[in-house]
Each structure stands twice: as C-alpha cells, then as structure tokens.
C-alpha cells in the first residue's frame, strides 16, 4: 500500500569536493533508475561552530527510509554528520534539524543553504 | 543503548490470529522505518514485512500478502504485525528489526516464537 | 520471484581466508541493491556484519569485509577464528520496499 507518493525526476545538486570529485559545483541533477525502483533527493552537511557547511546534495537510489518524506529534515540527536533525505521534485533544497528526543519535546533548528 | 522487545507469540490453532508487539527504545522510532523478518524452526531468514516512517507505505512478502497487517504507533514507538488466517508454515520465531539508510536492518530483537498447530 | 542465493556450506582452517558469496536469478548483484551481510548464532539474534556492499558495522572487526565480485555481492572473512563459526546471511534490497535474503552459508572453522 502505498499513500500519497510524489515522484522525484530531479533533485537540487551541490558538492563541496566538486574539484577533486571532478564534478559540477552546483546545479540540477536528473535523477535516473530502473522503472520498478523510487528515487529521492538528499542533502548532508556539517555545524561547525553554527555555520552550516554543505557537504553534499544531490538524487538518492530507492531507500525505504526516504519514503513518505516531503521534507528533508535531520532528526537524529546531535549527529556528526547531518543528513535527511526526501520524496518531490528538489525536496532538498531547504533541509532542516529537528532533533527528536524520546522524551522532551522538539527543538527547531531551520536550516538555510549556503552553497 | 537501542532495544527492541517483542511480544505477542504463542500457540495458536491453524486459521487463527495474533497480533505481536515490539516496543522500541533508545532512538527516534518516528524516524525509522521498520520491519518484521521471521525464521522457522532450523530454517533461514525470511524478511516478512516493513513499513515507512509515516506507515503510509506498507509492504509483504507474497506468502503473506492478504492475511499479514503491518503497523506502527509512533506516540507509543510501537511496531505491530497483525497476523490472521494462520497457516502451520507460519511457525517461526518473528523479529523486529529497525531499518536504517541504505535499507539494511541495523538493530534486531530478540524474537518471539509464534506456533501454528492444531 | 527473485530468488538469492548463497553457499549452503562452506569450512575454513583457523587463521584462514574464506569469501561467501551471494548472487540472483535476475541479474548481477550491484551496489544499487545496497547488499547487506548478518551473522547468526544458534539461538541468537542476528548481528549486522556489513552494509551497502562493504561498510562495516559498529563493533564489527576489520577481518570482516565486503565487496562485490564480478556480479555477485561477497563477504570475506580473514584471519578466521573459531567464535566465526556461524550462519551468514545477505540481504539485496530489491527497492519498492521489498528485502530478499538468501539462503544463508553455514561456516565451519575447522580443529
């Protein structure tokens, strides 16, 4: 069964090794795979010392963890590497924190991108 | 530290129900998806069922399809498997296990056995 | 059905090298099936050896390593110890929500 799904062709792309990787810097990254399989969109970065640092963003292969998610937002508590991933068309360009604890309540950090 | 309790098995006649449990702890359940993934006596892993964050998309294996409901109760970090019209090949012990990224099972239960027999 | 298939059996010498391997009736194995490898004990919980092809678990050994060869995913185990002796287990994530695992390899550390 499966509700409400959005389908994702094309995802923002930024990576910030591009010159070693050999890639673009940034842009828009056509999202390919096989017919029978999803695909998402992703974005990974770093809080050093409060400054967002993208590391990456970019399409994401079928990965049952991504679905359902309209929104690219990090829950996980205080991770080293920040990462949330995505159903929609460019769903990753606005990425979030929202750390979820088992017991207290949400605390929202928004996060704006400055490739 | 990440803990993942079932509960729900027992013996039940063939054509019966049961509907097990697995109580989560030390993670964000809600962010998570989750599975079920069963092992008859002596035999191998079977993966059974899973379920995404939202429980908006669901998913079986063809044996079970039709008779098996997956779940979840993301205000009580709880995983369900609804199990009716139980057949004796349904004897296995059942785990639940938590899916990360890249879609592997990062922590298990330790299972709770379900006999079907009459 | 996609099934996925691996060794039944397989016996390494203590100190050893053994690869187990984990191939489909559909294709080659790729990373995009993010091939994953469990061991299991006799009355154990499974334990999470290795993710998307070669990533290793927490707490898992480096003589633990995965890979994938020619079209097949394929875990290697070097230096093999007695406490290895155990079903090995992989999973290919088939997308659309659907996890297959193979048969399972029972290992034996022979002495």
């Known amino acids: 069964a499966i509700l409400g799904r959005s389908e994702t062709q094309e995802c923002l792309f930024f990576n910030a090794n591009w010159e070693k990787d050999r890639t673009n810097q940034t842009g828009v990254e056509p999202c390919y795979g096989d017919k029978d399989k999803r695909r998402h969109c992703f974005a990974t970065w770093k809080n050093i010392s409060g400054s967002i640092e993208i590391v990456k963003q970019g399409c994401w292969l079928d990965d049952i963890n991504c679905y359902d998610r309209t929104d690219c937002v990090e829950k996980k508590d205080s991770p080293e590497v920040y990462f949330c991933c995505c159903e929609g068309n460019m769903c990753n360009e606005k990425f979030s924190y929202f750390p979820q604890m088992e017991v207290t309540q949400p605390t929202s950090n928004p996060v704006t991108p400055k490739p | 530290e990440v803990q993942l309790l079932e509960s729900g098995g027992g013996l039940v006649q063939p054509g019966g129900s049961l509907r097990l449990s697995c109580a989560a702890s030390?993670?964000?359940?809600?962010?998570?998806?989750m599975s079920w993934v069963r092992q008859a006596p002596g035999k191998g892993l079977e993966w059974v069922s899973s379920?995404?964050?939202?429980?908006?998309?669901?998913y079986y294996t063809d044996s079970v399809k039709g008779r098996f409901t997956v779940s979840r109760d993301n205000s009580r970090n709880t995983l369900y498997l609804q199990m009716n019209s139980l057949r004796a090949e349904d004897t296995a012990v059942y785990y639940c296990?938590?899916?990360?990224?890249?879609?592997?099972?990062?922590?298990w239960g330790q299972g709770t056995l379900v006999t079907v027999s009459s | 059905q996609t099934v996925v298939t691996q060794e039944p059996s397989f016996s390494v010498s203590p100190g050893g090298t053994v690869t187990l391997t984990c191939g489909f009736n559909?294709?080659?194995?790729?990373?995009?099936?993010?091939p994953s490898w469990y061991q299991q004990t006799p009355g154990q919980a499974p334990r999470t050896l290795i993710y998307?092809?070669?990533t290793r678990s927490s707490g898992v050994p480096d003589r633990f390593s995965g890979s994938i060869l020619g079209n097949k995913a394929a875990l290697t185990i070097t230096g093999a110890q007695a406490d290895d002796e155990s079903d090995y287990y992989c999973?290919?994530?088939?997308?659309?929500?659907?996890?297959?695992f193979g048969g399972g390899t029972k290992l034996t550390v022979l002495g």
């Open positions: 296990a938590k899916v990360y990224y890249y879609s592997f099972f990062d922590y």
């Open positions: 030390g993670f964000t359940f809600r962010n998570s998806a």
């Open positions: 379920i995404s964050v939202t429980g908006g998309s669901t």
């Open positions: 559909s294709g080659s194995v790729s990373t995009s099936y993010y």
């Open positions: 998307n092809t070669n």
């Open positions: 999973v290919l994530y088939m997308g659309s929500g659907i996890h297959v």
